[in-house]
């Protein structure tokens, strides 16, 4: 079955880091990019960045540059998104989404991971 | 960054009626070389991830009912639901992928 399964909800303290995983199954990950998109409560979707799953090249949105790191482990068919220096405004649902080379849209999403930042 | 502006913010439509959602981008999303507009539409229901409906402004994703259609080019785009069904109640987002990615603010569609 073609799917993306994300790690479970996290509660973090301000200043800490969080690492969310996204495991792919049912397709060859090297043919795709994995994007990370977040959605704060009641807010619009916000693009964070992506990784080319074949060669690990990454591009990040300027807003997150220096605070987000997207990696991948091809042997585990898994992509990761780590966000550091967490603040309360980072409380959101974080999604991974698949984008096939040269098409520029998300045809498959993970179920989402709620990250709560609270002291 | 390219700014995506959706209107209206919310829309109440009777079952079987037409729903029209607009999306305006701050710059053209048309790549003249490929002839494609890099705009997609997604549907999101509470507690679920978004679901792809339309890509390249007007191409329907497989499995999406034909009551959903996309149109427009350049900076002005429209998502139309020709005959609203109960299961279409959701928030709809446009998204540009011409330069990186940005989403519109969403349009909530509910039943009148």
């Amino acid at each position: 079955q073609v799917q993306l399964v994300q790690s479970g909800a996290e509660v973090k303290k301000p200043g800490a880091s969080v690492k969310v995983s996204c495991k792919a199954s049912g397709f060859n990950i090297k043919d795709y990019y994995m994007h990370w998109v977040r959605q704060a409560p009641g807010q619009r979707l916000e693009w964070m960045g992506w990784i080319d799953l074949e060669n690990a090249n990454t591009i990040y949105d300027a807003k997150f540059q220096g605070r987000v790191t997207i990696t991948r482990d091809t042997s585990a068919s898994t992509a990761y998104m780590e966000l550091s220096s967490l603040r309360s405004e980072d409380t959101a649902v974080y999604y991974c989404a698949r984008d096939v080379y040269g098409r520029y849209f998300y045809d498959l999403w993970g179920q989402g991971t709620l990250v709560t930042v609270s002291s | 960054d390219i700014v995506m502006t959706q209107s209206p913010d919310s829309l109440a439509v009777s079952l079987g009626e037409r729903a029209t959602i607009n999306c305006k981008s701050s710059q053209s999303l048309l790549n003249a070389r490929t002839g494609k507009n890099y705009l997609a539409w997604y549907q999101q229901k509470p507690g679920q991830p978004p679901k792809l409906l339309i890509y390249w402004a007007s191409t329907r994703e497989s499995g999406v009912p034909d009551r959903f259609s996309g149109s427009g080019s350049g900076t002005d785009f429209t998502l139309t639901i020709s005959s609203l069904q109960a299961e279409d109640v959701a928030v709809y987002y446009c998204k540009q992928s011409y330069s990186r990615r940005t989403f519109g603010g969403g349009t909530k569609v509910e039943i009148k």
């Epitope: 990019y33 994007h35 992506w50 080319d52 074949e54 090249n57 591009i59 984008d99 080379y101 040269g102 520029y104 | 999303l29 790549n31 070389r33 490929t34 494609k36 890099y38 992928s97 011409y98 330069s99 990186r100």
Partner: antibody
Framework: QVQLVQSGAEVKKPGSSVKVSCKAS????????ISWVRQAPGQGLEWMGG????????NYAQKFQGRVTITADESTSTAYMELSSLRSEDTAVYYC????????????????????WGQGTLVTVSS | EIVMTQSPGTLSLSPGERATLSCRAS???????LAWYQQKPGQAPRLLIY???SRATGIPDRFSGSGSGTDFTLTISRLEPEDFAVYYC????????FGGGTKVEIK
């Protein structure tokens, strides 16, 4: 209409480097891609790598990784291809062309096919 | 890397005849990412077809492209004297590769 004009022929010694330029006119140079393709005498075409100037970083074919450097100067609308550690098998006509693989995940920045092409630059490697 | 194999290596035909050139990919290629080029001696290649079947600007309609998956075809419906040249197919995905070329010569 985009036009690409390349620098002139070069004769180089084995072990040295060569830098070929490709000046573009027409269109918005920063947002379109430039590839470099070579053709040895009587042989086929071989993609070496490409760059989208607005992003700055280049991508290379595995065969040339570590030996080729592709750069772009937006101020002069010029792309460059430098090949180092030259050997006799590098004797070829080197072409620049508009278009390159879009590694940058953004639909607005060109798309793959190569058109137009520069006129070609013959690089001869001989001792 | 995707290997593109063209056949035949050489095609000997008379003006007015139909030319059919084949290109096979070692793995499936999106039709969006398949192009054909024409090259004459001492000249740079010239784009004929992109997206497997879309004619480039200024290309006569006697040139047509078709195919999908791993098998693609360039057809010249009626050869003109200026069509005798070498033709290359190319896939332009992540790592572009060209076929070895088909030489179309006068019989």
């Amino acid at each position: 209409q985009v036009q690409l004009v390349q620098s002139g022929a070069e004769v180089k010694k084995p072990g040295s480097s060569v830098k070929v330029s490709c000046k573009a006119s027409g269109g918005t140079f920063s947002s379109y891609a430039i590839s470099w393709v070579r053709q040895a005498p009587g042989q086929g075409l071989e993609w070496m790598g490409g760059i989208i100037p607005i992003f700055g970083t280049a991508n290379y074919a595995q065969k040339f990784q570590g030996r080729v450097t592709i750069t772009a100067d937006e101020s002069t609308s010029t792309a460059y291809m430098e090949l180092s550690s030259l050997r006799s098998e590098d004797t070829a006509v080197y072409y620049c062309a508009r278009g390159a693989p879009n590694y940058y995940g953004s639909g607005g920045y060109d798309d793959g096919w190569f058109d137009p092409w520069g006129q070609g630059t013959l690089v001869t490697v001989s001792s | 890397e995707i290997v593109m194999t063209q056949s035949p290596g050489t095609l000997s035909l008379s003006p007015g005849e139909r030319a059919t050139l084949s290109c096979r990919a070692s793995q499936s290629v999106s039709s969006s990412y398949l192009a054909w080029y024409q090259q004459k001696p001492g000249q740079a290649p010239r784009l004929l077809i992109y997206g497997a079947s879309s004619r480039a600007t200024g290309i006569p309609d006697r040139f047509s492209g078709s195919g999908s998956g791993t098998d693609f075809t360039l057809t010249i419906s009626r050869l003109e004297p200026e069509d005798f040249a070498v033709y290359y197919c190319q896939q332009f995905g992540r790592y572009p590769t060209f076929g070895g070329g088909t030489k179309v010569e006068i019989k």
